[in-house]
């Protein structure tokens, strides 16, 4: 399987909410001997590999934000800790995997990574990630709503998030 990032750039005004999204593509094993670990973190564009470094999102580590389930089951992060920080990560039955950030500030700007680890009970493991940029803007140049820019493999037309 692979991870797709429908949008590579999100440009949002301060105070807005945004949902960053990744999508699992390809066959996903739903057997009892496989489980999926999914999480989000901030990172930097490393020399060797983007998303190598795992920094917290609003003081929550990738371990605080992780989801853990089999196949395409739906899952949500533990609400109390994440919601106190205005965060919620979720996963649906269709391979979509997201983190919602509420009341954005300029400090939220940066590179965000989703990580999916397919863990099999016999040693083998497949680890993939996706990366996207969030720019939070303030002042007269800021958009009124979040504007999302598709990844290069998609249609390059700007799409305004609902």
């Amino acid at each position: 399987f692979k991870v797709a990032t429908p949008y590579s750039l999100y440009v949002c005004p301060e105070g807005q909410n945004v949902t960053l999204t990744c999508r699992l593509l390809g066959p996903v094993d739903k057997g009892h001997d496989v489980t999926f670990y999914k999480t989000w973190y901030r990172s930097s564009r490393g020399e060797v590999q983007t998303c190598s470094e795992r920094r917290p999102i609003r003081n929550l580590t990738f371990q605080d934000l992780h989801l853990h389930h089999g196949g395409h089951q739906a899952a949500n992060t533990s609400h109390d800790l994440a919601q106190r920080h205005g965060l919620e990560s979720a996963s649906d039955h269709h391979g979509n995997f997201s983190i919602t950030m509420r009341n954005l500030t300029l400090l939220d700007s940066g590179l965000y990574c989703c990580l999916v680890v397919e863990i099999r009970h016999h040693h083998s493991e497949h680890r993939v990630h996706g990366a996207m940029e969030l720019q939070v803007q303030t002042g007269k140049d800021a958009p009124s709503n979040c504007v999302v820019y598709p990844s290069s493999s998609q249609d390059s037309e700007n799409i305004t998030a609902a």
Partner: antibody, heavy 120, light 107 residues
Framework: QVQLVQSGAEVKKPGSSVKVSCKAS????????ISWVRQAPGQGLEWMGG????????NYAQKFQGRVTITADESTSTAYMELSSLRSEDTAVYYC?????????????WGQGTLVTVSS | DIQMTQSPSSLSASVGDRVTITCRAS??????LNWYQQKPGKAPKLLIY???SLQSGVPSRFSGSGSGTDFTLTISSLQPEDFATYYC?????????FGQGTKVEIK
């Protein structure tokens, strides 16, 4: 804050077995692999095997296959490592450690270690 | 199994020195290389993960680099609390394997 607390030191006779426990607190137990790593006196670190509690079955280093059994009790957030047919060269400090995710995450939290002495 | 070879096995250095430890893997492991510090009688402590990423709470004088088969741990200015044994570890393939360790002693 995640903490791994191991059982106390043991002195065992050659040929016997030892079972070391590792109780986790402060984090999600089932999602993470717990690895067991040993260190003989003055020697380096050696991975013995690990378990992801939600699977219930463990993976072992070939060297220890057949002699080590790793189990986990999700209800008490405790992992166990049992080593049988002990010999003097099994004298070592045995550590449990948590993998950040899956089998191949780095080992970010460690227990304090349990000294097992095998002596006749 | 992937073999990890560290060099040197020991070194003597003074406070303030720049110290470099190398680790070589028997086959390519991409950037799946971690570094640990261990002091006598204590459990190892994770310093660097993914070859170059600093674990939370670790001082910035520690840095890691490398990819493929050759990796380096650097301590830019050795502090008294840095005298310890350092281990590299690969987590590219199971089983997890460690280097034999490098002991950093006071000159």
């Amino acid at each position: 804050q995640v903490q791994l607390v191991q059982s106390g030191a043991e002195v065992k006779k050659p040929g016997s077995s030892v079972k070391v426990s590792c109780k986790a607190s402060g984090g999600t137990f089932s999602s993470y692999a717990i690895s067991w790593v040993r260190q003989a006196p003055g020697q380096g670190l050696e991975w013995m095997g690990g378990i992801i509690p939600i699977f219930g079955t463990a993976n072992y280093a070939q060297k220890f296959q057949g002699r080590v059994t790793i189990t986990a009790d999700e209800s008490t957030s405790t992992a166990y490592m049992e080593l049988s047919s002990l010999r003097s060269e099994d004298t070592a400090v045995y550590y449990c450690a948590r993998n950040t995710f899956g089998w191949s995450g780095e080992l970010d939290y460690w227990g304090q270690g349990t000294l097992v002495t095998v002596s006749s | 199994d992937i073999q990890m070879t560290q060099s040197p096995s020991s070194l003597s250095a003074s406070v303030g020195d720049r110290v470099t430890i190398t680790c070589r893997a028997s086959q390519s492991i991409s950037n799946r290389l971690n570094w640990y510090q261990q002091k006598p009688g204590k459990a190892p402590k994770l310093l660097i993960y993914s070859a170059s990423s600093l674990q939370s709470g670790v001082p910035s004088r520690f840095s890691g680099s490398g990819s493929g088969t050759d990796f380096t741990l650097t301590i830019s200015s050795l502090q008294p609390e840095d005298f310890a044994t350092y281990y590299c570890q690969q987590n590219h393939d199971n089983p997890i394997t460690f280097g034999q360790g490098t002991k950093v002693e006071i000159k």
